[in-house]
């Protein structure tokens, strides 16, 4: 069974069959017979019943307010009525764009990797019995396949396969020819399988400072989404007021990765936070990297040889 | 032959009561929501939609103007759809019609029709 329309705020496109099937549908016949009543309301109107004098274009099942076509009028608020139980809808019909085969904005986007199975199925259950045929378009141009009822594409995919693709549903009803349209965007990019994170730079970083000025520990690594990224410094974090973990920020690399950068604000430097470790670690669920930083003093570094230091 | 026949109708003072059949022959009614429409005599507008039943009973929807003063049944054993019609009005006098169609649903998309019994309210 077709499952019931849940989602509160619905768009749909103009000219298209649509319907409305509320959520407390009995797959059981019901032993009784039940009043029931779909209403509407929109600024001009409140609460106008619904049924096929109200519209001609109106078709109402056991749970299915359908719509032969909908219209840009059909905008505003439904409800579904019986007994003690309501349900209500927001609906917006937006208009079809006549200069192409879908309307931009009633697109699903969906990325898939490069290499990696695509797979696209033309399916309307709720309308499958009345569909005289369907058709596929990539970027509005019909593709020749096989299968007429239910054209698919399944492949391994191209960097070529990006696009826009349409599947068109052609069916009857009362002597008339209506379509149904659900067109995806699919976006191909590299392979996005997970990296072994890394910490960029030297694993020990040594930092001439001065007593009483501020210095900022920059961390950067190359990881995937999910990872993390922190700060490890003294016993507790956070006991020292003058050292604060500034907010992570993150660029997506070509590739899909993410470039992550973490800086560590240490102000009016004290006795306290000479030669200690201050440790950046980036963890994922392959392992984790750490790089140390210690603070020497200025005066001292003439005692480490000149490549160890961080500028 | 495949016909339905509407019977029940006749004249009735205002406030009172009429039980209209629609008995189906040659097709199973069960399969189909009955469709109830009215037509003023002497008008030839297009007939109006009164009320429905769905095919498996658990449904009946209602125009305003009638709820809570008709109800529609139906007994598939029997292939035959009730509409029982209490606390008339002189404006309920009209032509009824039982028609049967995949929904309740406007008269053009009705696949059979009967040919009408007249209700006739005095006041």
């Known amino acids: 069974a077709e499952s019931c329309t849940s989602r509160p705020h619905i768009t749909v496109v103009e000219g298209e069959p649509f319907y409305l099937k509320h959520c407390s549908c009995s797959l059981a016949h019901e032993i009784e017979t039940t009043t029931k009543s779909w209403y509407k309301s929109s600024g001009s109107q409140e609460h106008v019943e619904l049924n096929p004098r109200s519209s001609s274009r109106i078709a109402l099942h056991d749970c299915v307010l359908e719509f032969w076509p909908v219209e840009l009028n059909d905008t505003g608020s439904y409800f579904f009525q019986m007994k003690n139980y309501t349900q209500k809808w927001k609906l917006n019909v937006i208009r079809r764009n006549k200069h192409s085969c879908f309307t931009e904005r009633q697109v699903t986007s969906k990325i898939v990797e490069v290499k990696k199975f695509f797979q696209i199925t033309c399916e309307n259950s709720y309308y499958q019995t009345l569909v005289n045929s369907t058709s596929l378009y990539k970027n509005c141009k019909k593709l020749l396949l096989e299968n007429n009822k239910n054209p698919t594409i399944k492949k391994n995919a191209e960097f070529e396969d990006q696009g826009y693709y349409s599947c068109v549903h052609f069916l009857h009803h009362n002597g008339k020819l209506f379509n149904i349209t659900k067109t995806f965007n699919i976006t191909i990019v590299e392979d996005r399988s997970n990296i072994v994170p890394v910490l960029l730079g030297p694993k020990l970083n040594h930092v001439a400072v001065e007593l009483g000025k501020n210095v900022r520990l920059n961390c950067s690594a190359l990881l995937n989404e999910e990872d993390v990224i922190y700060w490890m410094f003294g016993e507790e974090n956070g006991s020292d007021p003058n050292i604060h973990e500034e907010k992570e920020m993150r660029i997506m690399t070509p590739e899909g990765k993410w470039h992550a950068s973490k800086v560590l604000r240490i102000e009016n430097i004290g006795e306290s936070n000479l030669n200690v470790l201050y440790n950046c670690t980036v963890a994922s669920t392959g392992g984790t990297d750490t790089k140390s930083f210690i603070l020497v003093r200025k005066a001292d570094m003439a005692d480490i040889p000149g490549h160890v230091f961080t500028r | 032959d495949v016909q339905l026949q509407e019977s029940g109708g006749g004249l009735v003072q205002a406030g009172g009561s009429l039980r209209l059949s629609c008995a189906a022959s040659?097709?199973?009614?069960?399969?189909?929501?009955i469709n109830w429409f009215q037509q003023a005599p002497g008008k030839e507008r297009a007939r109006a939609w009164v009320?429905?039943?769905?095919?498996?009973?658990?449904?009946?929807y209602y125009v305003d103007s009638v709820k809570g003063r008709f109800t529609v049944s139906r007994d598939n054993a029997k292939n035959t759809v009730y509409l029982q019609m209490n606390s008339l009005k002189p404006e309920d006098t009209a032509f009824y019609y039982c028609?049967?169609?995949?929904?309740?649903?406007?008269?053009?998309?009705?696949?059979?029709w009967g040919k009408g019994t007249l209700v006739t309210v005095s006041s």
């Open positions: 028609a049967a169609g995949g929904a309740c649903a406007a008269a053009e998309t009705m696949n059979y």
């Open positions: 040659g097709f199973t009614l069960g399969a189909y929501a």
């Open positions: 009320l429905c039943i769905t095919s498996s009973g658990g449904s009946a």
